[in-house]
């Protein structure tokens, strides 16, 4: 009889432990849900405010056709410039045409005058070929005018209305580029 009672007591204790575990899991699940809900709400608010301001480019960016451009107000070396653009969901400027080059240089003249601005162009150390950041080659009319006399890595920059080259470790302004948002109207 005593053995039977102690078995029942042990079973009850086991059941209690399981219920406590379930309650703990539920509390954790509820907390996780609340957290997800908070993220969801923040995401929704972000999306709504973006939709409300449905401008094709973010604030302080310049639009030309399907592209948005950001002209930095800080100096950095080429690699840091690249990372700064990535933080904004963009890449260093890749100039596809003479028309785009003219737009950029015209805009720079209006904004800041004759400074140096890193673009997404770099020279392969082995072959000496100039390549954009996506691996494509620049069109013949968009090659840096002068070959930099540097043993270090060489990168491309825009100054006035020219594409030039320089040691990637020098400090310059930079230009980021991303696609403009299509209007859904």
């Amino acid at each position: 009889k005593l053995l039977q009672v102690s078995t029942i007591a042990m079973q009850q204790q086991e059941k209690l432990i399981q219920q406590e575990r379930a309650l703990l899991n539920f509390t954790e699940w509820k907390r996780s849900c609340a957290l997800q809900m908070k993220y969801c709400q923040a995401f929704m608010q972000n999306s709504l405010s973006s939709a409300h301001n449905s401008s094709p480019c973010p604030n302080n960016w310049i639009q030309n056709r399907e592209s948005c451009y950001y002209v930095s107000e800080i100096w950095s070396i080429w690699h840091t410039s690249q990372e700064n653009c990535l933080k904004e969901g963009s890449t260093l400027l890749q100039i596809e045409s003479k028309e785009e080059m003219d737009f950029i240089t015209g805009s720079l003249r209006k904004i800041k005058g004759s400074y140096d601005y890193w673009v997404g162009l770099s020279q392969d150390g082995h072959s000496g070929r100039w390549l954009w950041q996506d691996g494509s080659s620049p069109s013949p009319g968009l090659l840096p005018a002068e070959r930099s006399q540097s043993a270090n890595q060489v990168c491309g920059y825009v100054k006035s209305n020219s594409l030039l080259s320089s040691n990637c470790s020098t400090w310059k302004y930079f230009i980021c580029e991303k696609y403009a948002l299509r209007s859904s109207v």
Epitope: E83, L86, K87, T91, K178
Partner: nanobody
């Protein structure tokens, strides 16, 4: 926060291929771009490749034409397809999430290219 888990590293012969994966979770809506960095023993960590949310890629000169970065938004995963691997590609490869505020790093996955 954003959590990143890398996989796919290993030992491969020169000329071989590997595909690294980086799965993101957490506050992924704050991420504007994802990238792969690598660090070889005694060297600085360097950017290998990155891809923006709009799908624009960027590559280091040393991997252009050999490595391809891609993303699967439905799985919140970024991939690095590495072809024609060379001994100098040996390093720990880290995944990074770029946000306007903090940057988030994975734990890293070791890639060894050796015969």
């Amino acid at each position: 926060d954003v959590q990143l888990v890398e996989s796919g590293g290993g030992l491969v012969q020169p000329g071989g291929s590997l595909r690294l994966s980086c799965a993101a979770s957490g506050r992924i809506f704050s991420v504007n771009a994802m990238g792969w960095y690598r660090q070889a023993p005694g060297k600085q960590r360097e950017l290998v490749a990155a891809i923006t949310n709009q799908g624009a890629p960027t590559y280091a000169d040393s991997v252009k034409g050999r490595f391809t970065i891609s993303r699967d938004n439905s799985k919140n995963t970024v991939y690095l397809q590495m072809n024609s691997l060379r001994p100098e590609d040996t390093a720990v490869y880290y995944c990074k999430a770029f946000t306007r505020g903090d940057d988030y790093w994975g734990q890293g996955t070791l890639v060894t290219v050796s015969s």
